[in-house]
């Protein structure tokens, strides 16, 4: 049967991800790209009500409609883009990118014929210095009462999806409480998702600026016509070349037969939406686009019989659950999975600074990505964690 | 060595079940992906279907005249490999070759066991 | 599912013959190309992996080429025991097939 978001359900550009719905089956959400909004992005936004702008722009209701009022420099529906420069002003001092930590570049008529609009946590000419007092504070308390509500219920509500608001209490971020909390650098997570270096941002501590600091940044993906192949082709006993690349995988290892392994500390767990006996049934695809996303080697963990520890995850039991329910027993909706990280290729390439040295500083990243709305995994996930490893039981 | 044996062909009727085993010795065997080969007799090879490390997930997969009727599983704490045949045919009458796939191609294939389907 | 087409189904040959054997695939399969040699009652033994590569013990007198859905393996010069049935075998994409095998026999 084709995945919900195979039939490519979202229209105008929408994302589409797959969710659970309420009877436990496996759905899809379209994140929309604004001004269209609708289950399937189909209806077109008359009023600030109906627009989603990303999280901290707001709305502001025009003659032509609502639009995401953009912050200077930016631009474009969901303010992604970089504002071309005034007509009549040269872009060239603009080319260089010569604002640092996310600022925004403008173009002027004098020397230096440019100006950076910086950051919230940034100054200086060129945005180098972090301010002694950030532009914006960062939010001590979550403002908005009603998100006091909505934590935990397993929907990410955008509007609560703040640091000030512990991402919506994890509900945007896998769980995960502050994908940043290692971070001293204050304003990394608004930098996460800009697909500029960030050098004050680039340690592990503060989950390597998504790769924006390395040759091709995360925009070096893995080629699409070698996707499918090598999800096809991962770990399955033959070195593909073409598949042993960080952004695809490193083919599951089969070019590295003779290269010892180097796991990172403890163990990978993942809550995903899906039976075992489903997710197993597809887990090389499974393993390969994780490892993409990781830029680095994952594989099932395996207990002392040398089984893949894929565990059945059921539906936490409300009170009232129905006699027949429990009579059935619990009701499977999910697998919980244990993963290990094999650094053994992400050291041995060029950039071998970027490997995630522990399974913590994974679920991480995965967090951060969630919570950015940039998890590109098809892979239904509730939530991600890092556990200390323990030696399998034996049975 | 590297060593691989085949064992558990015989005669069986059509519709009878049939389970192959292939005991590895001299490798790694859990590390390995494993394939099943058949040849029909006087007749050229067919690949039967593989099985990937249980680290990856133990997946298998099956050429289309077999796939629902035989099933391939691995146990890599007694070192084998089975091949589990049901609602077994006249045409799937074979030497059955199990085969240790390598990255670098340093294949090893077992000596194979016959199975004869006949009534 | 991807067609392995071999050709001739069978030749004669004389040792020291040069011997062609072609092989066709019914889709690209980049270079996914693979030569076995098999002897009656035998096991298949590998020759060449990846269309041209020539596996470690066999003797330099095979060799392959080709990519896309032309193959060729060539013997340069016939020995005489290289006579034996020779299949190739695609596994870009599962199911992995085989061709239906060329025979080598002695003229």
């Known amino acids: 049967a084709l995945s919900p978001c195979e039939s490519q359900p979202c229209q105008h550009g929408g994302q589409c991800r797959h969710s659970l719905g309420r009877g436990g089956g496996l759905t899809f959400t379209c994140h929309c790209v604004p001004p269209f909004w609708g289950l399937r992005c189909e209806r077109v936004a008359r009023s600030c009500r109906e627009l989603q702008c990303p999280v901290g722009i707001p709305c502001q209701q025009t003659a032509r409609g609502p639009r995401c009022a953009c912050p200077p420099g930016l631009s474009g529906p969901s303010c992604r883009v970089s504002r071309a420069s005034p007509s009549g002003a040269t872009n060239a001092s603009c080319a260089s990118a010569p604002c640092l930590h996310g600022g925004s570049c403008l173009p002027v008529q004098s020397v230096p014929f440019f100006r950076c609009v910086c950051a919230p946590g940034w100054g200086g000419p060129r945005c180098e210095t972090p301010s002694a007092a950030p532009e914006v504070p960062e939010e001590p308390r979550c403002p908005r009462a009603a998100c006091q509500a909505k934590r935990g219920d397993q929907n990410c509500d955008r509007e609560c999806n703040t640091p000030g608001c512990g991402w919506d209490g994890g509900d945007c971020s896998l769980n995960v409480d502050d994908p940043w909390r290692q971070c001293e650098a204050l304003q990394c997570w608004r930098l996460f998702n800009n697909s500029r270096c960030d050098p004050a941002c680039s340690s592990p501590a503060c989950l390597y600026d998504n790769f924006d600091c390395y040759s091709g940044g995360r925009d070096r993906t893995c080629n699409p016509v070698y996707e499918k192949y090598c999800a096809d082709h991962f770990a399955d006993g033959r070195c593909d070349q073409g598949c042993n690349t960080e952004e695809c995988g490193w083919d599951g290892l089969d070019c590295a037969s003779e290269v010892p392994a180097l796991l990172a500390r403890g163990v990978l767990v993942l809550t995903v939406l899906l039976p075992p006996e489903e997710l197993l049934r597809s887990s090389a695809d499974f393993l390969q686009r994780l490892s993409a996303i990781l830029r680095t080697s994952l594989r099932f963990r395996l207990d002392a019989r040398g089984q893949a520890m894929v565990f059945p995850y059921h539906r936490p039991s409300p009170g009232s659950e129905s006699r027949v329910r429990r009579e059935l027993g619990p009701e499977v909706i999910g697998s919980v999975v244990m993963l290990e990280i094999d650094n053994r290729l992400c050291l041995q390439s060029a950039e071998n600074d970027h490997c995630f040295p522990d399974a913590q500083s994974a679920a991480d990243y995965l967090g951060a990505l969630s919570a950015v709305e940039r998890l590109d995994f098809p892979y239904p996930l509730r939530d991600v964690r890092g556990e200390p490893l323990e030696a399998p039981e034996q049975s | 060595q590297v060593q691989l044996v085949e064992s558990g062909g015989g005669l069986v009727k059509p519709g009878g079940s049939l389970r192959l085993s292939c005991a590895a010795s001299g490798f790694t065997f859990s590390t390995y992906v494993m394939h099943w080969v058949r040849q029909a007799p006087g007749k050229g090879l067919e690949w039967v279907g593989r099985i990937r490390a249980n680290a990856y997930g133990g997946a298998a997969d099956y050429a289309a005249p077999v796939k629902g009727r035989f099933t391939i599983s691995r146990d890599d704490s007694k070192n084998t490999l089975y091949l589990q045949m049901n609602s077994l045919k006249t045409e799937d009458t074979a030497v059955y070759y199990c085969?240790?796939?390598?990255?670098?191609?340093?294949?090893?294939w077992g000596q194979g066991t016959l199975v004869t389907v006949s009534s | 599912d991807i067609q392995m087409t071999q050709s001739p189904s069978s030749l004669s040959a004389s040792v020291g013959d040069r011997v062609t054997i072609t092989c066709r695939a019914s889709q690209s399969i980049s270079s996914h190309l693979n030569w076995y040699q098999q002897k009656p009652g035998k096991a298949p033994k590998l020759l060449i992996y990846?269309?041209?590569n020539l596996q470690s013990g066999v003797p330099s007198r095979f060799s392959g080429s080709g990519s896309g859905t032309d193959f060729t393996l060539t013997i340069s010069s016939l020995q005489p025991e290289d006579f034996a049935t020779y299949y190739c075998?695609?596994?870009?994409?599962?199911?992995?097939?085989f061709g239906q095998g060329t025979k080598v026999e002695i003229k």
């Open positions: 990846a269309a041209s």
């Open positions: 085969a240790r796939a390598e990255a670098r191609y340093r294949d090893v």
């Open positions: 075998q695609q596994d870009y994409h599962t199911p992995f097939t």
